[in-house]
């Protein structure tokens, strides 16, 4: 066969094969940010000639041209400055309204490098109608001026711009337009991670059992807890393995997929998950009508066997048929469970569609999602048990309409995307589903995503401090108690004078509670073995602390997940009848088990648990010190199995103030608390007045740093005995 | 509750190998920190540590019986097995499988196979 | 050396204590473990670190240690105490497993 030509460059930018030079193969332009391809691809025919997809000329040089965002085309009641036919990254447009009007939204926008504006429309409102004026995005054309009940709005784009979201919406019973707003955009512009992240996560944690803490009060009466705990959810994940996508950007799929499945599980709900690719036609991997697809792994090993040759013979995009599969499995599952029973009507289903273009054979796929609708009887009522999120990958050729058309259109929140590449659906896989959002005392949960503050990473996290100076560290174990340690208690016992720091998301500084009462062990007494020559003991270093208020769950203050606790067991999605032992082979499960703690300055660092016949040699090392054990016969003494041992290799060592703060480790995206800082032979923070400052010991020192921690599965009848009425503790 | 099972022929003839399994039910080979070990007795004789292995692969056996011994691990079967090389009829005994736990400064086995007998014979 | 010493036998009146000690330098490093063996059955064990005892053992069993031996004492022994106990524990290098020679309980 033929070969294409290869004088194919483009000034200023590079381009990609998905097939090198051979028939089939799609050559896809990429520019600098700031800049986008015209052409953006072209396709090697059989004949051997290069077709730029839409192109009604002859081969045309590809060049980078520069990105502008679309002008306002009117704006009520207000004016805008400064006024331009479109507008070049980085310029600004301003808003403001006349005498009697409000301004909604952002006062300034900025143009963004994807050809997109940051901030929010800005809308110049009189509070007049039923629905508060549905504003006018940029670039946007609207027909209709009344927002009482019932009234209706339209929307169109201006010149060549493209609409997504909703080109009609209703003033609604409850003050709030149906659908989701609309946007013109550019055909060459798309969607950066970090605001399809969010603005996909909000949609989906709505599903899964959170509200939107940042949804305005009014809009906030819409969409609530879905999902509840008892709830079910049929995840059906559908794959593009069409020719346009290279082999590379198929695993790139497969493993945001995977990201998303593990995601979903963390979840303490009932989640079924079913695994689709497509291209000339879809092949259905894992259905939701068998049981496997209930079990994380099952689903993801049957991801990781999806191959991208399954496909070869039949190299288009059939959109139409690959959702069709999901209409026939639904079918299939209502004939199962009978049409009319709860266990059918009550389950919500999330559809993500994963394709890099417009779909080229099989008829519309518009129609196959309107047999869903169909079979799952949405309407205004039951709106909320489907969710159809079509995102695009690639910016050559998606169709933005045919993913606007297949998107869900719900207020305030935003089902379809067109993202740059591959690596950008990771990211947003990565950060998307943000179960920090959740307002009750689901335990365990931090932001994971890069640009998350240190206290919405590690929430449970507070600090202890006298009148004075800092002093302790503890965990939030539940919506008043923190675990801490005993020895910070040892210096008097008036507590009142003592308050705790706990996250804020409207403070840097956090918010300070007083304590009700502390708890400490009765066992812990530092001075319990001097006659032995140890002159501080730390056995028995545990105390509670209930806080005078309850602290209202955020994003930077919940509690940790404590191990042998049915809220654990949810979180590490064990079954029923699971014991304290179970959570221990599972959480401390080998010789080196890695773990973090969190530092004076916030930041979490990595310690290594040494556990079985490691756990000694860790140990051993405190028979070298002889300032703090001067007359030391027996290490046992000193160092009981009460402890965890870490330090060794390249631990980082905690400093003294950081005592009592939490020891833990993450499992299925969750954190789960093993052990409490009590002491250590080296502290990395002496004589330095900077929290950023650690020095690690020199290699040479004798004893090297060794750093002890209260085991949380040694403390279980002292816990039992205190928390029996905040948690549920499982049987031993 | 944990149940460990031996299983393995009776008889072995002298200068063979030896080899027996041991299954784990009511729990996974792989979950926790335990050490998979084989112990012996020989008829009205005391206890004998043959070795244990780590689900991460780390194996400690007895010097005594230096180089003859093989504990080897299979996670997907929930077994692990014990191979004595070049046996004589000193090695004849009851042959039990456990599961060690290193907790703090002690070392114990606290679930054992009810044992098999092998018997050496020329 | 890597040994563990136990009394070959020792008696005791019903409902009355005894104590079988076990002896080896390895004890000034690590705790034993003792297990109690009737006669065709397999060991099980009785107790292990400081003082500890598994669940299901009664607490006329405990267990004790000082320099470089270890005793386990029954308090008020039964006529089902009469059985071998066997003590156990890593050796002097930490690296390797010993058993004592073990100890016949007869219970008079």
């Known amino acids: 066969a033929p070969s294409c030509p290869q004088n194919v460059n483009i000034s200023g930018g590079t381009f990609t094969l998905s097939h090198g030079w051979a028939p089939g193969s799609l050559l896809t332009y990429s520019c600098p940010q700031g800049l986008y391809p015209s052409p953006a691809s072209r396709l090697c025919k059989s004949s051997g000639q290069w077709q730029t997809p839409g192109a009604t000329r002859s081969l045309s040089k590809a060049v980078c041209k520069p990105v502008r965002c679309p002008a306002p085309v009117s704006f009520e009641n207000g004016i805008y400055t400064p006024r331009l036919g479109s507008y070049p990254v980085g310029g600004n447009v301003s808003f403001e309204c006349e005498d009697g009007f409000i301004l909604r939204g952002s006062p300034v926008r900025q143009c963004r490098p994807n050809g997109m504006w940051d901030g929010e429309t800005a809308v110049c409102d009189n509070g007049a109608g039923h629905c508060p004026n549905p504003g006018i995005s940029l670039g946007a054309v609207r027909t209709g001026f009344r927002f009482g009940h019932g009234d209706k709005v339209r929307y169109r784009c201006s010149s060549n711009l493209v609409l997504t979201g909703s080109s009609e919406r209703e003033c609604q019973g409850n003050g709030v337009w149906s659908g989701t707003e609309p946007i013109c955009r550019q055909p060459y512009s798309y969607d950066f991670p970090e605001d399809v992240a969010p603005a996909l996560g909000t949609s989906f944690s709505h599903m899964l059992g959170a509200t939107n803490p940042t949804q305005k009060t009014k809009e906030s009466l819409g969409r609530k807890i879905q999902i509840q705990r008892s709830g079910h959810l049929n995840l059906y994940l559908l794959l593009d393995c069409s020719q346009s996508v290279s082999e590379n950007d198929f695993l790139i799929f497969k493993e945001s997929a995977s990201l998303m499945v593990d995601r979903i599980f963390s979840f303490e709900i009932n989640v079924s998950v079913a695994i689709i690719t497509f291209a000339s036609e879809p092949k259905v991997l894992m259905s939701v009508l068998n049981d496997n697809s209930r079990d994380m792994t099952e689903v993801i090993s049957s991801l990781e066997n999806a191959n991208y040759k399954d496909h070869e013979n039949g190299t288009g995009t059939n959109t139409y048929a690959a959702l069709n599969s999901v209409y026939l499995m639904m079918n299939n599952q209502m004939r199962l469970l009978g049409m009319e029973t709860m266990a059918w009507q009550e389950i919500r289903h999330a559809i993500i569609l994963l394709t890099d273009g417009k779909s080229n054979m099989g008829g519309s796929p518009k129609t196959a999602v309107d047999h869903i609708r169909e079979i799952l009887n949405i309407n205004q009522k039951r709106n909320d048990y489907l969710d159809i999120y079509a995102i695009g990958v690639g910016k050559l050729d998606v169709d933005w309409r045919e993913l606007n058309e297949l998107g869900s259109k719900k207020d305030g929140e935003r089902h379809a995307f067109i993202l740059q590449d591959t690596k950008a659906l990771h990211q947003v896989f990565e950060h998307m589903l943000d179960v920090s959002k959740l307002t009750d005392t689901i335990c365990g949960v931090g932001n994971m995503s890069a640009n998350a503050s240190d206290q919405e990473r590690t929430p449970w996290h507070v600090t202890i401090k006298p009148k004075s100076q800092e002093t302790c560290r503890g965990a939030l174990i539940s919506d008043q108690w923190v675990l801490t340690a005993a020895h910070c208690f040892r210096d008097g016992n008036d507590h009142s004078l003592w308050r705790v720091n706990v996250g804020d998301p409207k403070s840097q500084w956090g918010k300070e509670f007083l304590i009700e009462k502390a708890v400490i062990s009765p066992g812990f007494d530092v001075f319990a073995k001097k006659n032995q020559g140890i002159l501080e003991f730390y056995g028995d270093d545990i105390a509670l602390l209930k806080l005078a208020q309850k602290v209202k769950m955020s994003t930077h203050a919940r509690p940790i997940c404590l191990p042998c606790t049915m809220e654990a067991n949810l979180a590490l999605r064990r079954p029923q009848g699971s014991t304290c032992r179970d959570h221990e082979n599972e959480l401390l499960n080998k010789q080196s088990v890695p773990a973090h703690f969190v530092a004076l300055n916030g930041s979490k660092l990595n310690i290594n648990l040494k556990m079985g016949v490691e756990w000694t040699s860790c140990a051993e090392v405190v028979s070298q010190e002889k300032t703090m054990f001067p007359n030391l016969t027996d290490v046992r003494e000193v160092v009981t199995d009460q402890f965890l041992c870490s330090g060794t290799q390249e631990d980082e060592s905690p400093c003294k103030g950081e005592s009592g703060g939490a020891v833990f480790l993450e499992r299925r995206f969750r954190f789960f608390q093993v052990g409490l800082v009590s002491w250590g032979l080296y502290n990395p923070c002496l004589g330095s007045a900077d929290k950023n400052s650690r020095k690690r010991a020199p290699r040479s020192k004798v004893p090297p740093p060794r750093d002890f921690h209260i085991n949380l599965f040694r403390m279980q009848p002292w816990l039992r005995q205190h928390l029996g009425d905040v948690l549920n503790f499982l049987p031993l | 509750q944990l149940q460990l099972q031996e299983s393995g022929p009776g008889l072995v003839k002298t200068s063979e190998t030896l080899s027996l399994t041991c299954t784990v039910s009511g729990g996974s080979i792989t979950s926790g920190v335990y050490y998979w070990g084989w112990i012996r007795q020989p008829p009205g004789k005391g206890l004998e540590w043959i070795g244990s292995?780590?689900?991460?692969?780390?194996?400690y056996n007895n010097p005594s019986l230096k180089s003859r011994v093989t504990i080897f691990i299979d996670t997907s079967k929930n077994q692990f097995s014990l191979k004595l090389s070049s046996v004589t009829a000193a090695d004849t005994a009851v042959y039990y499988c456990?599961?060690?736990?290193?907790?703090?400064?002690?070392?114990?086995?606290?679930?054992w196979g009810q044992g098999t007998l092998v018997t050496v014979s020329s | 050396s890597s040994e563990l010493t136990q009394d070959p036998a020792v008696s005791v009146a019903l409902g009355q204590t005894v104590r079988i000690t076990c002896q080896g330098d390895?004890?000034?490093?690590?705790?034993a473990s003792w297990y109690q063996q009737k006669p065709g059955q397999a060991p099980v064990l009785v107790g292990y670190g400081k003082n500890n005892r598994p669940s299901g053992i009664p607490d006329r069993f405990s267990g004790s240690t000082s320099g470089n031996a270890a005793s386990l004492t029954i308090t008020g022994s039964q006529a089902e105490d009469e059985a071998d106990y066997y003590c156990n524990s890593r050796d002097s290098s930490g690296d390797h497993l010993i058993f004592g020679g073990g100890t016949k309980l007869t219970v008079l």
């Open positions: 390895s004890l000034r490093r690590f705790y």
């Open positions: 292995i780590y689900h991460g692969g780390n194996t």
């Open positions: 456990a599961e060690g736990v290193s907790s703090g400064w002690s070392y114990y086995f606290d679930y």
